[in-house]
Amino acid sequence: EVEKTACPSGKKAREIDESLIFYKKWELEACVDAALLATQMDRVNAIPFTYEQLDVLKHKLDELYPQGYPESVIQHLGYLFLKMSPEDIRKWNVTSLETLKALLEVNKGHEMSPQVATLIDRFVKGRGQLDKDTLDTLTAFYPGYLCSLSPEELSSVPPSSIWAVRPQDLDTCDPRQLDVLYPKARLAFQNMNGSEYFVKIQSFLGGAPTEDLKALSQQNVSMDLATFMKLRTDAVLPLTVAEVQKLLGPHVEGLKAEERHRPVRDWILRQRQDDLDTLGLGLQGGIPNGYLVLDLSMQEALS
C-alpha cells in the first residue's frame, strides 16, 4: 500500500467546519478522520466544498464503510449523494422515508438520474410494496414515476395507495400500465357515489373494459373527449351509438373533430350508418343500410 502523506502540524481537523474548504485535497485526505466525518455529515452540506473536495470526503466514507453506508450517514449525505454511483447505492439499506425525502430533495428539479432510480428501487424492494406514503413522496418529486414502472412492478401497488395518485401522474402511462392500475383504482374508489367516483376513476379509464364503460354510460357522467380518446380501442368498439352518446353527454359533438383518429375512427367503422346519423354530426364511414354484420370473433369461437 502507498504510504499516506502525514497531516501537517496543527491542521488535524477536530470538527467538520468551514476552515476545511481551504484545505488542499491531500490535506483533507490526511487531516480529516473518517469517523469524525461520519458523525458530522450533517455539516458537510452547509459548507461550500468543491467537487474535488467532495470526492475526497466520499473516498474517506468508502474506506470506513466498504460494505455500504449506514442510514445515519446516508440521511445527511446532501450534495455528496450526487457523487454516488448506482453501485454504491446498491450496497445501502434505506428504510426511512425521511432519508429518501432528504436525498430526493438534493436531486429536485432534475430528471430522474440512475442514482435516484437505484435508490428508489432499493427503498421499494426493502419495503416489499409501494405503500401510500412512499407513492405520495415519489410522485411529488417525480410526477411521471408511476408510469416508469413495469406492469409487474405496478402489481405490487396496493389499492389503498391509489388515493395518492394525481391525474398528471398518469400522463405518460401506456395501456399495459393502465390495465394493471385500473382494477386497483376501481377497488379503491368502489364506495364512492356516482359523480365523485367518476372524478376519481377518470384518469385510470384507459384500462377499463367494455362492460365498465357500458355501466358508466348509464350514470350521466359526461366524459370529455380527451378521456374518451385514451380509452382502449377494443373496449370502445362494442359500444353502441346510444351508449357513446350517453357516455359523452354534451361532449358527443367532439366526435366530429376526432373522426379520423383512433378509437373514434375504428368505432365509426363498426356502427350502422343509420345509427350514426341519429347523432346529427355528419359522421361518415359506418356500415351502409341493408348490410349484414358478422361478428367474426363469435364465429371463430364456435368453429
Epitope: K11, E18, S19, F22, R43, A46, I47
Partner: antibody
Framework: EVQLLESGGGLVQPGGSLRLSCAAS????????MSWVRQAPGKGLEWVSG????????YYADSVRGRFTVSRDNSKNTLYLQMNSLRAEDTAVYYC?????????WGQGTLVTVSS | QSVLTQPPSASGTPGQRVTISCTGS????????VSWYQQLPGTAPKLLIY???KRPSGVPDRFSGSKSGTSASLAISGLRSEDEADYYC???????????FGGGTKVTVL
C-alpha cells in the same frame, strides 16, 4: 480561549488613512479565514472584507473596494485592514471576526471616526 | 437597504415564543448556509446559530434556527428578559462574492 483584539482606531479627517490590526490567540490562526465587519453608530452590521488562510484571494464589500486592503501575517497571528481615502460614512466600530461564512468569534471592536 | 430582509422589531412576554424571519434570494440563503447573531446593548455580536440550525456550545437550546428555500428563521422559545437584544441573520452571497447581513431585528421583552 479564543481572543481577538483590535487596535488602530481613532479620529481621522476625510481623505485620510488608518491601519487597523487584529491580534488573534487561542486557535491555529493560519488554518482559518478572517473577516472585518463594521457597525455605524445606531445602525446594523455591515461586512467589510474577508481573507482566506493563505491570502490567495481577498474579498471586499462594494462600498470599500479600491480604498481598503485586507492582509494577514500568519507568523504574527495578526489580521490587518489598511483604510485609505476615508469618508464620513466609514465612521463605525470595526470588528475583526474569525471565519468568512459564520463568524464564531468577534473582537470587542475599535472605533473609527472620520470627521473634519 | 440590506440584501437580507428582517422585520425591524419583534416582542413577546416572558415564556412566550418569538420567531424572526430572514428573506433572501437564490444567490445567498438559497445556496449558502445561514448564521444568526445576537448583539446585546453595548457589546460585540455573538454567534447564536450557524450552518442554518447548529448551536455553538453555550447557546441555550431555547434558540433554534431553520432554513427553507430562500428564507430562514430564528425561534426563541421561553423568552427571557436577558434575550432583549438585536438579532442579525447573515449568509455568503455567491453573486456579490461577499457576506451579507439582514438589517437586524430588535427583540423586546414586554
Amino acid at each position: 480561549e479564543v481572543q481577538l483584539l483590535e487596535s488602530g482606531g481613532g479620529l481621522v479627517q476625510p481623505g485620510g488613512s488608518l491601519r487597523l490590526s487584529c491580534a488573534a490567540s487561542g486557535f491555529t490562526f493560519s488554518n482559518y479565514a478572517m473577516s472585518w465587519v463594521r457597525q455605524a453608530p445606531g445602525k446594523g452590521l455591515e461586512w467589510v472584507s474577508g481573507i482566506p488562510p493563505d491570502s490567495a484571494s481577498k474579498y471586499y464589500a462594494d462600498s470599500v473596494r479600491g480604498r481598503f486592503t485586507v492582509s494577514r501575517d500568519n507568523s504574527k497571528n495578526t489580521l490587518y485592514l489598511q483604510m485609505n481615502s476615508l469618508r464620513a460614512e466609514d465612521t463605525a466600530v470595526y470588528y475583526c471576526a474569525k471565519n468568512m461564512l459564520s463568524f464564531d468569534y468577534w473582537g470587542q471592536g475599535t472605533l473609527v471616526t472620520v470627521s473634519s | 437597504q440590506s440584501v437580507l430582509t428582517q422585520p425591524p422589531s419583534a416582542s413577546g412576554t416572558p415564556g412566550q415564543r418569538v420567531t424572526i424571519s430572514c428573506t433572501g434570494s437564490s444567490s445567498n440563503i438559497g445556496s449558502n448556509a445561514v448564521s444568526w447573531y445576537q448583539q446585546l446593548p453595548g457589546t460585540a455580536p455573538k454567534l447564536l446559530i450557524y450552518y442554518n440550525s447548529k448551536r455553538p456550545s453555550g447557546v441555550p437550546d431555547r434558540f433554534s434556527g431553520s432554513k427553507s428555500g430562500t428564507s430562514a428563521s430564528l425561534a426563541i422559545s421561553g423568552l427571557r428578559s436577558e434575550d432583549e437584544a438585536d438579532y442579525y441573520c447573515g449568509s455568503w452571497d455567491s453573486s456579490l462574492n461577499g457576506y451579507v447581513f439582514g438589517g437586524g431585528t430588535k427583540v423586546t421583552v414586554l
